[in-house]
Every structure is written in C-alpha cells, then in structure tokens.
Amino acid sequence: DLLNHKKFLLLPPVNFTIKATGLAQVLLHWDPNPDQEQRHVDLEYHVKINAPQEDEYDTRKTESKCVTPLHEGFAASVRTILKSSHTTLASSWVSAELKAPPGSPGTSVTNLTCTTHTVVSSHTHLRPYQVSLRCTWLVGKDAPEDTQYFLYYRFGVLTEKCQEYSRDALNRNTACWFPRTFINSKGFEQLAVHINGSSKRAAIKPFDQLFSPLAIDQVNPPRNVTVEIESNSLYIQWEKPLSAFPDHCFNYELKIYNTKNGHIQKEKLIANKFISKIDDVSTYSIQVRAAVSSPCRMPGRWGEWSQPIYVGKERKSLVEWH
C-alpha cells in the first residue's frame, strides 16, 4: 500500500498554465511531474480556483476548462493527489494567474442587463427559429466623455461582435441589439457577454458577465388573439407565442378588464382558449400573456402582454387579429 509507505512522495504537477481561450473562458493545463515514481498508480489532481470566485474540484485529466468573468483576473492552483479508501495523499501546490486587464474600475460599464426573444429565422429551411439579443448598460462613473464601449457575446464556441448600438447624448454606446444570434434559449450553456472600451484619456477597464439563457429569455406575446361575443358569453382564443417550444409548453394568463366598472378578471390557464360570462352594457379589454411551463424547462417569467382587444357595447360580435 503506497499510502502507508513512509518514503512515498507525491510531486506537484509541472508546466501549469492558464490561457484565455475565449470570452470569459480559460483553459488550465498542466503535466504530470516527470520525476514522479510509481507513475502507474492512479493519480488525480485537485484544482483550486482562488479568484475571481473560490471553487475546488478533483479531476483525472491534465486540463480543465473554466467559464468565469475575467475582468478581475483569474488565479488557480493545482496539486497531485492519491486517494485510498481511508486517506488522501497530496503534493504541494503549484499556482498560476492571469492578471486583471488594465483600467481603473470606475471606467467599466455597470448595470449590464440582457434579454433574448425568439424570432423567425433568416434560414427557415435549416431551423425555423433564432434568438435575438438586446443588452443595455450604464457608462462607468469615471469614464471620460470620449469613452466608446464595444460589446461581444460568446455562446459555445461562437463569438460575435455587436454591429448595432444605441447611444447616449455624448454618442457613447449604451445598448446593443443583435437581430439574430447563435444563442439557444432552450440550452443550459451560459451566455458570456464582454464589453471593452477605448478612450484617448484613460485605459477603460473591460467587463464580463455570464447569463443563463433560460433566465433572460423573454417570452413573446401570444399570437392571433381572437375574441367573439355570443349571447352574453365571451369566447377568447389565441395561438402560442412565436417560440421553438411546442404548444403544451406554455401556461397563460388572461386579463379581462371591464372598462365600465374597472373590474379586472385574471385567469391562469393551460389551454389556449377561455369562455367568460359578461353583461351586455360594458366594454371589455382583453389581453393574454404566456410563460414557458415546467414540463419543458424550469418555469420562466411571464412574457409581454398581447395588444388589448376591445369588445362589447355596440361591438356585439367582433373578431380582431393581432
């Protein structure tokens, strides 16, 4: 039993490097120590992420990929370990780091928020739906007036640079719009967003943020809402939102507003139709919104309301399409 052998020495890995391989993504790589005796034994490695956020894990491989913001730098350590049923032997640590990029903290963007929407694909024969991305941010409080910001996103192995910006009064980019992206809003991979900047007066500190596509996906409003009045009943029907998710993946909320007395009736539904009793002297406003439900993914936020449809009073039988 090697672990009980007093003279058995575990040597640390060698050639430990940390390399940025993409936006908010690093590759840690090391080699087994060439001087390690008994190299046929089952050696493992204990990796410790020291910054920007502490984490640790064991691996049998000699490399490890980490997805994490890099604007504050990145530091990690690794050591060789040998496990048995009752004890673990460990070598000393070796460490490496990526320095934080230059720039004072107050120059980087703040309050970065991003949302995605499903849109019709430009290549419908390949896949019918794609995802649009909109991000907004605030200019850093210490950023010079001539600062210009540039946004990039990475999803999986694909990276794109923003081409369509909104600007503030000083012509600085403060929002970005991608009409179509490579993002899969059904996936579990994280979306990495990186904003760097330039100025003649100061070094602008970059900023990275990771988003869960599920968390930032904004469900479109239900389509083709139709309303019909027939003998004091309101027949309301709609189609699922524009989405890659099928019909059964949606829950709905229906809002019927009586404009005469101000009463609001709200219904949570799993069906795409509803019948409601009404009086014949009021006008009603009808809106529907959708959310992706639990059979298909973690329940998401409610999407946007459909445009209101007004029925009632003189409009005895009306069908409107939106």
Epitope: F245, P246, D247, H248, L269, I270, A271, K273, F274, P295
Partner: antibody, heavy 124, light 107 residues
Framework: EVQLQQSGAELGKPGTSVKLSCKVS????????IHWVNQRPGKGLEWIGR????????IYAEKFKNKATLTADTSSNTAYMQLSQLKSDDTAIYFC?????????????????WGQGASVTVSS | DIQMTQSPASLSASLGETVTIECRTS??????LAWYQQKPGKSPQLLIY???SLHTGVPSRFSGSGSGTQYSLKINSLQSEDVASYSC?????????FGSGTKLEIK
C-alpha cells in the same frame, strides 16, 4: 359529470360514406378540442385528427386527410366525423375524446374523457 | 411525424411484481407524453400526462418518468385489475402519435 355519447355501430359498403357523432354533455365543447382516434381489430390506437369547435378548424394526420372530415355543431354540443370512400381496412372502432378544462393538470392536448367507441364495419 | 417505439409488445408478470414499459420517440418531445390504459372492450383511460404527472384518481402505484426522447411507465405492486393494454402518446407536435401498445398479462 362530462360524458361523450357516440352514435351506434355502422355497417358500410365499400366506396360509401358514414358519419359518426359524438354528443358531449356537461361541458361546452367550444372550450376544448375534440379528438378522434381509431383502433383496428387487434391493433393499437391511431390518432385521426382533432377539431376546434370554437372556430371549426380541423387538423388531420396525413393518412386521414382524404378519408376523414371533422365538423362540430356548437348549438347541439356535438362533434362529427365523416369517413368517405370506405374500404375494408377502415373497419375499426372509432373513439371521440376530449380534455376537460382545468386551470392546472393536462392541457387541451391530452385526452382525459372518451366516448364509448363506435364500431364501423366495411363489407360488401 | 414523430415516430413512437414502444416496448415490449407484451409482457407477463406475477401479482405484486413491478413492471416497466418503455417508449422512445424519434425526436425530443419536451415531456409532452401521456400514458393510457385500455381494458378489453373498453375505452382508453388517461393515467399519466406531461411524462410524470399522475392524472386525478389514478392509483399511486402508477408512475411515469423520462425526458427528451426516452420515457417509461412503471407499475409497482401489480394488481389483477391492471391487466390491460398500455399505450404512450406524444402531444408535442401535430400529428399526435401513439405507441404500438403493450399488452400486460398476469402469470
């Protein structure tokens, strides 16, 4: 209680048509979909199509597009299926089915209430 | 159309045993799967919807599981009244499609 009452057994000659009915009591069919399913002797279930009684829009499985015609009459709360150009392999039991609306539970795509089935025999 | 591959076609088990029926789909159906029980000469009855939700009034010895393209129905502690045919059905995409059915018998 929701009930789906189907018309009786039909005996049809090859090339002719039959029309089956499904009367729903205890639920307004405008608030659901009516599905039709068949089962040939000794075989499994087969989805024929569904109709949305609120607007009369049907959806058919490809193989039944020129075979079945789905309609609904909301005033009598009844759905119908006409089978045309009958052949011997149309011999089967035909079920109507629907979902009873709930605010939770299965959506209108799941069949949780069924008719008793109507036997159609095609023979010369 | 989404193809449904149900197995086994038939199975025989003893009272009190646990049995499992599998259903594989040709593409991801996002848990849009129902299981039905049909006793001889009767109409089908809904057991499970959304792959794993037990329909009202169905005994808890029935359970559904799975995701993506692989789903299963499990019957714990088999009873004599469970003799029937069992079918899976996907409602993720039109046209809806059924599995070929599994005939369950008691040994």
């Amino acid at each position: 209680e929701v009930q789906l009452q189907q018309s009786g057994a039909e005996l049809g000659k090859p090339g002719t048509s039959v029309k089956l009915s499904c009367k729903v009591s205890g639920y307004n069919i405008k608030n659901t979909y009516i599905h039709w399913v068949n089962q040939r002797p000794g075989k499994g279930l087969e989805w024929i199509g569904r109709i949305d009684p609120a607007n009369g829009n049907p959806i058919y499985a490809e193989k039944f597009k020129n075979k079945a015609t789905l309609t609904a009459d909301t005033s009598s709360n009844t759905a119908y299926m006409q089978l045309s150009q009958l052949k011997s392999d149309d011999t089967a039991i035909y079920f109507c089915a629907m979902h009873r609306g709930h605010s939770m539970g299965p959506g209108p795509y799941v069949m949780d209430a069924w008719g008793q089935g109507a036997s159609v025999t095609v023979s010369s | 159309d989404i193809q449904m591959t149900q197995s086994p076609a038939s199975l025989s088990a003893s009272l009190g045993e646990t049995v499992t029926i599998e259903c594989r789909t040709s593409e991801d159906i996002y848990n849009g799967l129902a299981w039905y029980q049909q006793k001889p000469g009767k109409s089908p009855q809904l057991l499970i919807y959304n792959a794993n939700s037990l329909h009202t009034g169905v005994p808890s010895r029935f359970s559904g599981s799975g995701s993506g393209t692989q789903y299963s129905l499990k019957i714990n502690s088999l009873q004599s009244e469970d003799v029937a045919s069992y079918s899976c059905q996907q409602y993720s995409n039109y046209p809806f499609t059924f599995g070929s059915g599994t005939k369950l018998e008691i040994k």
